[in-house]
């Protein structure tokens, strides 16, 4: 409505004697600024005077003067928006209606605010959620419709008269909408808080009690139970009786059903507060509890661990680890259900008691083959001794033992024989699955662990075998000791170190690289003729006639071997020189005559010199001296000299006769 002044403030304000009131207020005048403001207490409109009557608590005029008695009431507003008021202290008789008379240049307005001042501080109000359940966080609210800047207060929470540990959050509101002080407490109630008194206490700044509000907590919770057992330690022997009783110490709302559980599983037909177990067996050992339900849910008691004691049951042995490798460690564990736990153990290996082993575990640090077998145990507790179970088998694995390579052939073995070897061993676990042989060869393995060497070589010295399961064990190598005829027989010149010259002393050696057996004989031959039976063949003074092809033979009991033919070469100066003439020693003049210097030399003649009857050397140096045409003057005695690297040789004189031709005779 545009004809009204617009005000905003709380409808009613609350306070108590001696406190104060802070009145938040805003307005909007119809026109212009505020020119006059009067605060009335219980104003009444006088129709006659057309003015308001009542106690004037505050008055402001155009000149801004305020009577001194009005200091209790303060106008904290302004001329156009704010109309906030403060009364400090406030008195009981300030209760009623406050009238704010506002005047502008042309308009007037009376705004009414209710003030409720009580004789004593009024109590705050506790607000609870509609339902409280155990362990679920709730917020408790304490609300007081009061707040004033000049009068500080505090709200404190108490549980059964004791300050609560949880931190509360206090908030205040002094707005045109609302005036209050509020404390909020977050709290997780437990079942034990059910029925307890919660108090919100109003205190002044010094902590002095002013007022309070109380509520009784109604905490919904599952039934809270106590379990009692006879006997109290819950330790019995098989055949004894046990009684368990379930007592409800608290339930909100009331409980509806009862049941019993063993190891978390419900026991059938057990729906009373007493559980009777007669003549218990060991299977009845376990954790027992009772469960009682209400609308909130089921509640469980603490667990009672019922121990039904019994002598050890037949034991079993666990082996870590089988099969075991020789030299490794092995642990045996004796497992036997018993209550109380066994205190003593007796161990057996292949039925024989293992002295001194009385613990649950047996440790063998280095397993050896004879530790294999069946291990069993017997457990013992205060109630008796168990039975020996079936036991566990320890398999001890190891490489083949005492491996040997055995030659099956009659001895001695000869080169070219077929040799059979076998690979033997003493024991093995697991079984031998394959064999290896050294050195490797293109040999036959006719059956497992047997090696056949066809046409055995002279140089097959040693052979070793390995028998293999998961591991290979090698035997010491065995010597085949193959016998063979002498090998690599050859002729070797010992003396002289350089070439052989006629007249030299010469020694030839018959060498061979090896022979088995070692005992040998030698034979020398030249052109099929036996020359000697020593390893050496000696010439005191060699002659060219000794040159030729020589062989030596070496033989042993297995056979004989010949060397390659070896050529003996004797070097000598030219010898047996002679001059031969062609076509003859008588030649007709004008024809051709060829003189040849023939010789025997090693190496062959490299240089010839021709001489005439005057021992005059002729300027010819080849083997043949060709005279063409021949002249009568050429008649005479000729000789030649041959030279090689060893020396020189000369021929005897040979006479050439050149006779006249018929023509020449005819001319004469």
């Amino acid at each position: 409505d545009s004809s009204k002044w617009v005000f905003e403030h709380p409808e009613t304000l609350y306070a108590w004697e001696g406190a104060c009131v802070w009145i938040p207020c805003t307005y909007r005048a119809l026109d212009g600024d505020l020119e006059s403001f009067i605060l009335f207490h219980n104003p009444e409109y006088n129709k006659n005077t057309s003015k308001f009557d009542g106690t004037r608590l505050y008055e402001s005029t155009k000149d801004g003067k305020v009577p001194s008695e009005q200091k209790r009431v303060q106008f904290l507003g302004d001329k156009n928006k704010n109309c906030t008021l403060s009364i400090h202290p406030v008195h009981l008789n300030d209760s009623g209606q406050l009238g704010l008379r506002m005047e502008s240049k042309t308009e007037k307005w009376m705004e009414r605010i209710h003030l409720n001042v009580s004789e004593r501080p009024f109590p705050p109000h506790i607000q609870l959620p509609p339902e409280i359940q155990e362990s679920q966080e709730v917020t408790l609210t304490c609300l007081l419709n009061f707040s004033c800047y000049g009068y500080p207060i505090q709200l404190q929470w108490l549980l059964e008269g004791v300050p609560m540990r949880q931190a509360a959050v206090t908030s205040t509101s002094l707005t045109i909408k609302s005036v209050f002080t509020r404390s909020e407490l977050k709290f997780s109630p437990q079942w034990s808080h059910h029925g307890k008194i919660v108090t919100c206490q109003l205190q002044d700044a010094d902590g002095k009690f002013l007022s309070n509000d109380t509520v009784q907590l109604n905490v919904k919770h599952t039934p809270k139970l106590e379990i009692k057992v006879t006997p109290s330690d819950a330790i019995v022997r098989e055949g004894d009786s046990v009684t368990m009783t379930c007592e409800v110490s608290s339930s909100n709302p009331e409980y509806t059903t009862v049941s019993w559980l063993k190891d978390g599983t419900s026991l059938k037909k057990q729906n009373t507060f007493t559980l009777n177990l007669r003549e218990v067996t060991k299977d009845q050992s376990g954790k027992y509890c009772c469960q009682v339900s209400n609308d909130v849910g089921p509640g469980r008691s603490e667990e009672v661990f019922l121990q039904v004691q019994y002598a050890p049951e037949p034991s079993t042995v666990q082996i870590l680890h089988s099969p075991a490798v020789e030299g490794s460690q092995v642990e045996f564990l004796c497992m036997s259900l018993a209550n109380p736990l066994p205190t003593n153990y007796t161990w057996y290996h292949n039925g024989k008691e293992m002295q001194g082993r009385t613990e649950e575990k047996v440790h063998i640090p280095k397993i050896l083959p004879w530790h294999a077998g069946t291990y069993s145990c017997v457990a013992e507790n205060i109630l008796g001794t168990g039975q020996r179970g079936p036991g566990a088998e320890l398999d001890v694995q190891y490489p083949p033992k005492k491996v040997t390579t055995v030659i099956q052939n009659p001895m001695p073995i000869r080169e070219g024989d077929t040799v059979t070897l076998s690979c033997n061993y003493n024991s093995s676990n697991p079984s031998v699955t394959r064999y290896e042989w050294k050195p490797h060869g293109a040999w036959e393995e006719p059956s497992l662990g047997v090696l056949k060497i066809q046409n055995v070589g002279w140089d097959n010295t040693t052979i070793a075998c390995a028998a293999c399961n998961s591991w290979c064990s090698w035997a010491s190598p065995v010597a085949l000791n193959v016998q063979y005829a002498p090998r690599d027989v050859r002729v070797r010149k010992i003396k002289p170190l350089s070439e052989i010259h006629s007249g030299n002393s010469v020694s030839l050696q018959c060498d061979f690289s090896s022979s088995h057996p070692k005992e040998v004989q030698f034979f020398w031959e030249k052109n099929g003729r036996l020359l000697g039976k020593e390893s050496q063949l000696n010439f005191d003074s060699i002659s060219p006639e000794d040159a030729g092809s020589y062989s030596c033979w070496v033989n042993n009991s297995i056979g004989q071997t010949a060397s390659k033919a070896w050529t003996l070469e004797v070097l000598y100066a030219p010898r047996r020189l002679r001059v031969s003439m062609s076509p003859g020693d008588q030649v007709m003049e004008g024809k051709s005559a060829t003189l040849t210097c023939e010789s025997d030399a090693n190496p062959p003649v490299s240089h010839y010199t021709w001489f005439d009857w005057n021992n005059q050397s002729l300027p010819y140096h080849s083997q043949k001296l060709r005279l063409e045409p021949v002249k009568v003057q050429h008649s005479g005695a000729y000789w030649c000299q041959g030279t090689n690297s060893v020396g020189k040789g000369r021929s005897p004189l040979s006479t050439l006769t050149v006779y006249y031709s018929p023509e020449t005779i005819g001319r004469r």
């Epitope: 030299g327 440790h363 063998i364 397993i367 050896l368």
Partner: antibody, heavy 122, light 107 residues
Framework: QVQLQQSGAEQVKPGASVKMSCKAS????????IEWMKQNHGESLDWIGN????????EYNEKFKGKATLTVEKSSNTVFLELSRLTSDDSAVYYC???????????????WGTGTTVTVSS | DIVMTQSQKFMSTTVGDRVSITCKAG??????VAWYQQKPGQSPKLLIY???TRYIGVPERFTGSGSGTDFTLTITNMQSEDLADYFC?????????FGTGTKLELK
């Protein structure tokens, strides 16, 4: 009857070495380790070490490493203890003892040798 | 090393007496304790193993007890042939160690 026969008493000079023997009989020699003990003039016993005749495995007390050497001769069922760089502290009775069939190093001893007295004196 | 202490070096006794020889281990050795008897010029002889088990052929008057750190060898009805040195030994930990011995003498 299980027996461990030890070699006779030894009188040796300081700095020298001594090798004593222990011959086993009455049981399978290679199935039990042989332990050695030192006893000073009727006083407490000290464990020296052990050897297994099956595989010549040895183990020594840290205190006797470098002093004692154990060896075995399977062909004669004999174990040897050699003590080197002898001093007067080595004068004692040395016992060979049969160890545990299951090779436990944590054991007690039921079969003792006859003992070898070693006297180290210049 | 675990020290085995036999606090009494000598003990005087008479024939027919009940004698208790004690041995204290430097740390818990469970029941891994053996007792030996040694007569002058002889090798030690095993009497008890596993703290309380009598070895084959050992007379019933010898009993062993204890576990952890405290052990006792008891001879009920002491005989003159029982005059000897007695040693305890632990075999719970390596190296194996022996007590210093207790010598039984006639009063």
């Amino acid at each position: 009857q299980v027996q461990l026969q030890q070699s006779g008493a030894e009188q040796v000079k300081p700095g020298a070495s001594v090798k004593m023997s222990c011959k086993a009989s009455g049981y399978t020699f290679t199935t039990y380790p042989i332990e050695w003990m030192k006893q000073n003039h009727g006083e407490s016993l000290d464990w020296i070490g052990n050897i297994h005749p099956y595989n010549d495995d040895t183990e020594y007390n840290e205190k006797f490493k470098g002093k004692a050497t154990l060896t075995v001769e399977k062909s004669s069922n004999t174990v040897f203890l050699e003590l080197s760089r002898l001093t007067s502290d080595d004068s004692a009775v040395y016992y060979c003892v049969r160890g545990d069939y299951y090779n436990s190093r944590y054991w007690y001893f039921d079969v003792w040798g006859t003992g070898t007295t070693v006297t180290v004196s210049s | 090393d675990i020290v085995m202490t036999q606090s009494q070096k000598f003990m005087s006794t008479t024939v027919g007496d009940r004698v208790s020889i004690t041995c204290k281990a430097g740390q818990n050795v469970r029941t891994a304790v053996a007792w030996y008897q040694q007569k002058p010029g002889q090798s030690p002889k095993l009497l008890i193993y596993s703290a309380s088990t009598r070895y084959i052929g050992v007379p019933e008057r010898f009993t062993g007890s204890g576990s952890g750190t405290d052990f006792t060898l008891t001879i009920t009805n002491m005989q003159s042939e029982d005059l000897a040195d007695y040693f305890c030994q632990q075999y719970s930990s390596f190296p194996l160690t022996f007590g210093t011995g207790t010598k039984l003498e006639l009063k």
